[in-house]
Amino acid sequence: SDAYLNASETTTLSPSGSAVISTTTIATTPSKPTCDEKYANITVDYLYNKETKLFTAKLNVNENVECGNNTCTNNEVHNLTECKNASVSISHNSCTAPDKTLILDVPPGVEKFQLHDCTQVEKADTTICLKWKNIETFTCDTQNITYRFQCGNMIFDNKEIKLENLEPEHEYKCDSEILYNNHKFTNASKIIKTDFGSPGEPQIIFCRSEAAHQGVITWNPPQRSFHNFTLCYIKETEKDCLNLDKNLIKYDLQNLKPYTKYVLSLHAYIIAKVQRNGSAAMCHFTTKSAPPSQVWNMTVSMTSDNSMHVKCRPPRDRNGPHERYHLEVEAGNTLVRNESHKNCDFRVKDLQYSTDYTFKAYFHNGDYPGEPFILHHSTSYNSKAHHHHHHHH
């Protein structure tokens, strides 16, 4: 019947050693051995019926024996309950009394055990964990149950095993059996393939900036399997990351800030049982300088009839290595003053009276001038030349 599990697969129970038939030879008349002697080392296999949840004990003998009070058909004792002892009295016409009294120590039901993969997904690329789980209770003494694993040439006598330092993407076969009173009654095999490992490190070929707002990075991909790349670029404390297609070997970075150091990190990753990131390859570059932005909050204030105080705030983006403020003063189209200071604070004295002037303030970063902030202001007539001197407001 299909309901029976083949003993060699899952439910064999046989004491260690093989059956030995003892015979005594007498020259004149051959005498029969006792059945107790003849069947001293009898072995038993247990067959489990998944439908009835009962065992059948198969007696490993060469002839059809009798089983006393227990009926046995074709050397099989039927309807044995798990974890219960049954006594069988074995006799045969080839042997004499006393009969062999065989105690059948029935194991737990096979379905009460399950071989479980306990591998942590994070470590599934280099480790395997297998564990026998008791999924239902039984009354057999658990101290009489032992577990055995064989994985390759390694043998473990544990309920749970952990194999470490394995190769990713490799198949490993583990055979396991459970023994009751040192006799195997179930076994299982598992072939486990370790997960994809972390990809290797990409090899950066070059990484540079040849413009103020752009940079480029090129690389060779790692050897091991991967799904995509992550490219991160960091300026000061700001970090931006991009997901890049696995087929890319070059990426052009756009909209970068001029005269800024960028640190780039590139790693491959694979989405397996979990996402595994490979080691990051690092490089850096500094973008070229560019014109600074306009100074802001420029003010022109009259300090006398023909003197001005010009101030401004630094540009939001300097975009270059140095810091210098320039003030150009024009009357008509003629440049009449051109000053340069470390700070945007200019005292412009001794201008012509009653004259229109244009004041242009801009920032220079050592490489480029910025756009000027322009204000127009006229000087007054010379009030000191008049007899009535007014308060300066």
Partner: nanobody
């Protein structure tokens, strides 16, 4: 305490002219004065400034040659003549008078102004 009140704002076509005035009351009119404006969503910006006797003026580059600031001290009134207006001139225009402690004769810096009007809306349609 000086109070300032602007007049003359309104809706005007691009290319037209408009004259804003600012009446001062409650104090002497012996301060430098100025006009500032603020467009929606933008910061307040300097437009024009004039010293106490009208002898010196200053302008933002965007209005130079189109706008003229003047004052009539006898009437305690400040003016802004706006010619050839464009939609970019649309804003609320504020009149301002210098703070008493200012050491300057004029200034384009709003921090140097201690008195401000409520503002008048100028809208230039294209």
């Amino acid at each position: 305490q000086v109070q300032l009140q602007e007049f003359g704002g309104g809706l005007v076509q691009a290319g037209a002219s408009l004259r804003l005035s600012c009446a001062a009351s409650g104090g002497t009119f012996s301060y430098f004065m100025g006009w500032f404006r603020q467009a929606p969503g933008k910061e307040r910006e300097f437009v024009a400034t004039i010293n106490r006797n009208g002898g010196a003026t200053g302008y933002a580059d965007s209005v130079k040659g189109r706008f003229t600031i003047s004052r009539d001290n006898a009437k305690n009134t400040l003016y802004l003549q706006m010619d050839s207006v464009t939609p970019e001139d649309t804003a609320v225009y504020y009149c301002a008078a210098a703070r008493e402690s200012s050491v300057y004769y004029t200034s384009t810096d709003p921090a140097e102004y201690g008195y401000w009007g409520q503002g008048t809306q100028v809208t230039v349609s294209s």
